[in-house]
């Protein structure tokens, strides 16, 4: 959106005559009609596609035109437009004689025209005026013109809308190209995010206004980088809130019980690692191939059925061994000793020797697959048609019958209002008969999913063991407040069990 401005400066008609050569009586009471239209290689008298404007009578015969209002008309003349400025134009300026007070076209005699000029060319948006002078046999017109953007419109074509604001929806001013320039202390695409105090912990701190650092539950300190341990924790520390991770040799809910069962009893067998986990309790971490509370039981590696093609598995000290049936070999009996001479290809498949006849490969006819062409292909099983298209088997080929609004071999192309991806923030676009509709992801709303809304992060019940869940509305995250006897960011660990052993 913008305005084409035309400033009439001086009109000279020394002899006071009309275009026909007839003199005006008593003088030429002159007013102007202006027609602005798209660029034409040959300017023609047709409709004024960009707009028209008329002046009142500005003077008689020869006169200068003031820069302000003259006889009720504005100078410069304003020709507003509400489209992208194309950068080119055609301009027609007509000077007319008004014998009376009625300036309507139908009220004037056809020979009341004094002069008519037409120009065309390129014109970029800008503040600078272009000065021009057009002379005919009897008249001369001096004028200047320019194109400027309307308020809140920017860019080379006045096509970018930007309105400065300093409220909940954004804190910014507009640059000359229409891009946003955040006010000090604000960031983000729409300058909605405050810039917190320098060094404020990214996850554990937040702010609702610039240079602030507010701590989330369980964190403390000027920069919210110190966790708050479990209340009453004695010989322990925390790495996440409400933890009480005991120092070496200490146990109990508050790390006030001495425990060192591993050192005194060495309960773990077969080279397992022992961890103290409470008063007179321990945990053994077994080496591969062992299981049991104390890692006393040996695992059989044949339990996973590693041998293929009917091979039988035998346990060995250093692993296992596969005994292959006739026709197969390899570590897992995965290789076939069959050749093309055994006619292994079904359904008309052609056999090709490989590795000097030691192996083979089947080339399957259309509609069959598998290493021996033993499987029939249903071309529709892979569901190749996108966007709800219906798959139709057509002999050796297939085709997709597309839903309205889609096209392409696999209905992969939109032919709809959704083609320009109008839904913000990952919203899903649905074509409707009279437009489109956006289905927004959690946390967003509005006709185009452009409005961010808060999510109840606790809605999915992320905390275990009857812990209390708190939602932080400014970041849409949760914090779990653990009951007595449990720790962890979700209160998932009984006290004393390290997080690396989730049983």
């Amino acid at each position: 959106s913008g305005v084409f401005q035309l400033q009439l400066q001086e009109f000279i008609n020394e002899r006071g005559v009309l275009a026909s050569g007839r003199p005006c009586e008593p003088g030429c009471r002159t007013f102007f009609r202006v027609c602005l239209k798209h660029f034409q290689a040959v300017v023609s008298p047709g409709p004024c596609t960009f707009g028209t404007v008329s002046t009142p009578v500005l003077g008689t015969n020869s006169f200068a035109v003031r820069d302000d209002s003259s006889g009720g008309g504005r100078n410069p003349l304003q020709l507003p437009f509400n489209f992208t400025w194309p950068g080119t134009f055609s301009l027609i300026i007509e000077a007319w004689h008004a014998p009376g007070d009625d300036l309507r076209p139908e009220a004037l005699p056809p020979d009341a025209l004094i002069s008519k000029i037409a120009i065309q060319g390129s014109l970029a948006v800008g503040q600078n005026w272009l000065l021009d002078e057009q002379t005919s046999t009897l008249t001369r017109l001096r004028y200047s013109y320019r194109v400027i953007c309307s308020d809140n419109y920017y860019g080379d074509n006045c096509s970018r809308l930007c309105k400065k604001r300093n409220d909940h929806f954004g804190h910014y001013v507009c640059q000359p190209d229409g891009n946003l320039s955040c006010l000090p202390g604000w960031t983000g695409e729409y300058c909605q995010q405050p810039i917190c105090l320098s060094g404020c912990h990214e996850q554990n701190g937040y702010c609702s206004k610039p240079a602030e650092c507010l701590c989330r539950p369980g964190w403390q300190g000027r920069l919210c980088n110190e966790c708050i341990p479990h209340n009453g924790c004695r010989h322990g520390t925390c790495s996440t809130p409400w933890q009480c991770t005991c120092d070496e040799g200490w146990g109990g809910l508050f790390c006030d019980q001495d425990l060192n069962y591993c050192t005194h009893h060495s309960p773990c067998k077969n080279g397992a690692t022992c961890s103290n986990s409470g008063q007179r309790s321990y945990t053994c971490t077994c080496r591969p191939g062992y299981t049991g509370v104390d890692c006393e039981l040996e695992l059989s590696e044949c339990d996973s059925n590693p041998c293929r093609n009917g091979g039988s598995c035998k346990d060995q000290e250093d692993g296992y061994h596969c005994l292959c049936p006739p026709g197969y070999y390899g570590l897992h009996c995965e290789h076939s000793t069959l050749s093309c001479a055994d006619s292994p290809c079904f359904n008309g498949g052609s056999c090709r020797e490989r590795n000097q006849g030691a192996n083979y490969a089947c080339e399957c006819p259309p509609n069959f697959t598998g290493s021996n062409c033993e499987k029939k292909v249903d071309r529709c099983t892979s569901n190749p048609c996108a966007n709800g298209g219906q798959c139709l088997n057509r002999g050796p080929s297939r085709m997709c019958r597309c839903r309205p609004g889609f096209t392409g071999t696999y209905c992969e192309l939109h032919v709809s209002d959704c083609a320009r991806n109008p839904c913000a923030h990952g919203g899903t676009c649905h074509d409707l008969e009279n437009g489109l509709m956006c289905t927004c992801p959690a946390g967003f709303s509005g006709r185009r999913c452009e409005v961010r809304t808060s999510i109840d992060a606790c809605a999915s019940s992320p905390c275990f063991n009857r812990a209390t869940c708190y939602t932080d509305l400014s970041t849409d995250t949760f914090v779990c407040n653990c009951p007595y006897g449990f720790v962890g960011s979700r209160c998932e660990f009984p006290v004393g069990l390290p997080p690396s052993f989730p049983w």
Partner: antibody, heavy 121, light 111 residues
């Protein structure tokens, strides 16, 4: 080359509305041309009715302005003519046409084959 | 409205001869040094076809046998030499003043 195809009803009752569609192929109706409706009466007299410029600007024959409108659907590359309160005098062959607006405004270089509409009770 | 009067209403010309069709406007169709007069050919059962635009400019694909001239209110379409394929009705049209108008047509036949 630009191609145009008219479609619409063969028969309309007096006082009803006549709606015609022109489908344009091989040229976008939003690029550099103007798109017209012209009708030819049974005696072969031609009358220019209206046009829609590529920018969306519309222009009508003043004698029809009170009962005519021209619109477009850019997604389908179609433009439409709506003529209200028809009488038997409106029976004609209706043509849609296109002109290169920057080079020869008013000279219509591309024409459809025409569609005949009869107003009768 | 500008009224366009074509003459003659019908014309019979021998093959290879010159055909001249006249179009007179009720007022000038000149603007900015151009005459906004155009000529069309219409064969039976077909839409009109643009031959000449702005008085004398030959439309792309039209043979040079067709030419146009004139200014202000008097205009002429000339076909020289006439061929059998030229049998049609010829219309003039102005776009200088609203509404755009057509002439009544001249029917060309072969003698």
């Amino acid at each position: 080359d630009v191609q145009l195809q008219e479609s619409g009803p063969d028969l309309v009752k007096p006082s009803q509305s006549l709606s015609l569609t022109c489908t344009v192929t091989d040229h976008s109706i939003t690029s550099g041309y103007s798109w017209h409706w012209i009708r030819q009466f049974p005696g072969n007299k031609l009358e220019w009715m209206a046009y829609i410029h590529y920018s969306g600007y519309t222009h009508y024959n003043p004698s029809l302005k009170s009962r005519i409108s021209i619109t477009r659907d850019t997604s389908k590359n179609q433009f439409f003519l709506h003529l209200n309160s028809v009488t038997t005098e409106d029976s004609a062959t209706f043509y849609c046409a296109g002109s290169d607006y920057s080079a020869n405004e008013g000279a219509m270089a591309y024409w459809g084959q025409g569609t005949s509409a009869t107003v009768s009770s | 409205d500008i009224v366009l009067t074509q003459s003659p209403a019908s014309l019979a010309v021998s093959l290879g001869q010159r055909a001249t069709i006249s179009c007179r406007a009720s007022e000038s169709v000149d603007s900015f040094g151009n005459s906004f007069m155009h000529w069309y050919q219409q064969k039976a059962g077909q839409p009109p076809k643009l031959l000449i635009y702005r008085t004398s400019n030959l439309q792309s694909g039209i043979p040079a046998r067709f030419s146009g001239s004139g200014s202000r209110t008097d205009f002429t379409l000339t076909i020289n030499p006439v061929e059998a394929d030229d049998v049609a009705t010829y219309y003039c049209q102005q776009s200088n003043e609203d509404p755009w108008t057509f002439g009544g047509g001249t029917k060309l036949e072969i003698k």
